[in-house]
Interface confidence: low
């Protein structure tokens, strides 16, 4: 897969991909996997790929399925380097009270905050 | 401050005394704060409270100024709780499979994505 | 069916040392896993007391062993050595070994403080008592 590929188009296919495998990825019924138990799906990034890679070591390779896990692995890049964008550039306080305000916004406005 | 006001309650708050005390918080103007280079928050919130610790030690303390530092304080730890809830419940495959597809649900249409 | 079966375990004097191994059998999954021991004394929490990566990398240790506890690996016959020395009356606890099959996705095996909820596999545990 050809990393050029834009990251919206990967997230697109693989959703297409984890539906076609559905079936193949939940035949071991003993296995147990942490699922976070709320909707701030960014905050646990780490969990979710680590998730990931406990299904990857114990489901058969081959085909469109290891196309689903490069895949993923890809999105993990993506989201890796959205990471280290966090703390790259330092700006006046002006410009972090701005950040600070717009993150407050968006947890005020869009979070799944259960008290 | 009760740590039972609800969280929701606490974010409102706090943006209104962020707006309060702008002036007063960006009275140092050679300090510098990492601020994140994209608006997907949620990735960045360590590097958010880590200039939120910057800017309280160079702001004098006291009024409403502690209590917005002391916000966001409560507001950290109730992140910090959220983050610990990301991998503290085992699931069968197929409820990690949900949760995986939400998130990439999610990725795809609500994140700011810069290929 | 997998199954990790600790050995080792007993009195030791404090200062005295114990070496603690594990054997895991009937592992499914091709490729390495996160190998980590715990422990648990009457009345607390399992916490976690070394965890790694077996295909490589760093071992985390939890700061109350660092330095007294090393971790080995015998790859020929998947047995997993838990070396413990300088023992302290405050080591008394169950022992448990714990597998799971992490890729290198997750990152934080051997990284980070494992938590015990993220281990599919457990032994049964071992007794260590340490008298001063």
């Known amino acids: 897969i050809p990393t050029e590929i834009p990251t919206s188009a990967l997230v697109k296919e693989t959703l297409a991909l984890l539906s076609t495998h559905r079936t193949l990825l939940i035949a071991n019924e003993t296995l147990r996997i942490p699922v976070p138990v709320h909707k701030n799906h960014q905050l646990c990034t780490e969990e979710i790929f680590q998730g990931i890679g406990t299904l990857e070591s114990q489901t058969v390779q081959g085909g469109t399925v290891e196309r689903l896990f490069k895949n993923l692995s890809l999105i993990k890049k993506y989201i890796d380097g959205q990471k280290k964008k966090c703390g790259e550039e330092r700006r006046r306080v002006n410009q972090f009270l701005d950040y600070l305000q717009e993150f407050l916004g968006v947890m005020n406005t869009e979070w799944i905050i259960e008290s | 401050i009760p740590t039972e006001i609800p969280t929701s309650a606490l974010v409102k708050e706090t943006l209104a005394l962020l707006s309060t005390h702008r002036t007063l918080l960006i009275a140092n103007e050679t300090l510098r704060i990492p601020v994140p280079v994209h608006k997907n928050h949620q990735l960045c919130t360590e590097e958010i409270f880590q200039g939120i610790g910057t800017l309280e030690s160079q702001t004098v303390q006291g009024g409403t100024v502690e209590r917005l530092f002391k916000n966001l304080s409560l507001i950290k730890k109730y992140i910090d709780g959220q983050k610990k809830k990301c991998g503290e419940e085992r699931r069968r495959v197929n409820q990690f499979l949900d949760y995986l597809q939400e998130f990439l649900g999610v990725m795809n249409t609500e994140w700011i994505i810069e290929s | 069916q997998v199954q990790l079966q600790e050995s080792g375990g007993g009195s030791a004097q404090a200062g005295g040392s114990l070496k603690l191994s594990c054997v895991v059998s009937?592992?499914?999954?091709?490729?390495?896993?996160?190998m980590g021991w715990f422990r648990q004394a009457p009345g607390k929490e399992r916490e976690g007391v070394a965890a790694?990566?077996?295909?490589?990398?760093?071992?985390y240790y939890a700061d109350s062993v660092k330095g007294r506890f090393t971790t080995s690996q015998d790859n020929a016959t998947s047995t997993f050595h838990l070396q413990m020395n300088s023992l302290k009356p405050e080591d008394t606890a169950t022992y448990y070994c714990?597998?799971?099959?992490?890729?290198?996705?997750?990152?934080?095996?051997?990284?980070?403080?494992?938590?015990?909820?993220?281990?599919?596999?457990w032994g049964q545990g071992t007794q260590v008592t340490v008298s001063s």
């Open positions: 714990a597998a799971d099959p992490w890729s290198v996705y997750g990152g934080s095996c051997g990284v980070k403080d494992p938590n015990p909820k993220a281990f599919n596999y």
């Open positions: 009937g592992y499914p999954y091709s490729g390495d896993y996160c």
């Open positions: 790694f990566y077996t295909g490589g990398g760093s071992t």
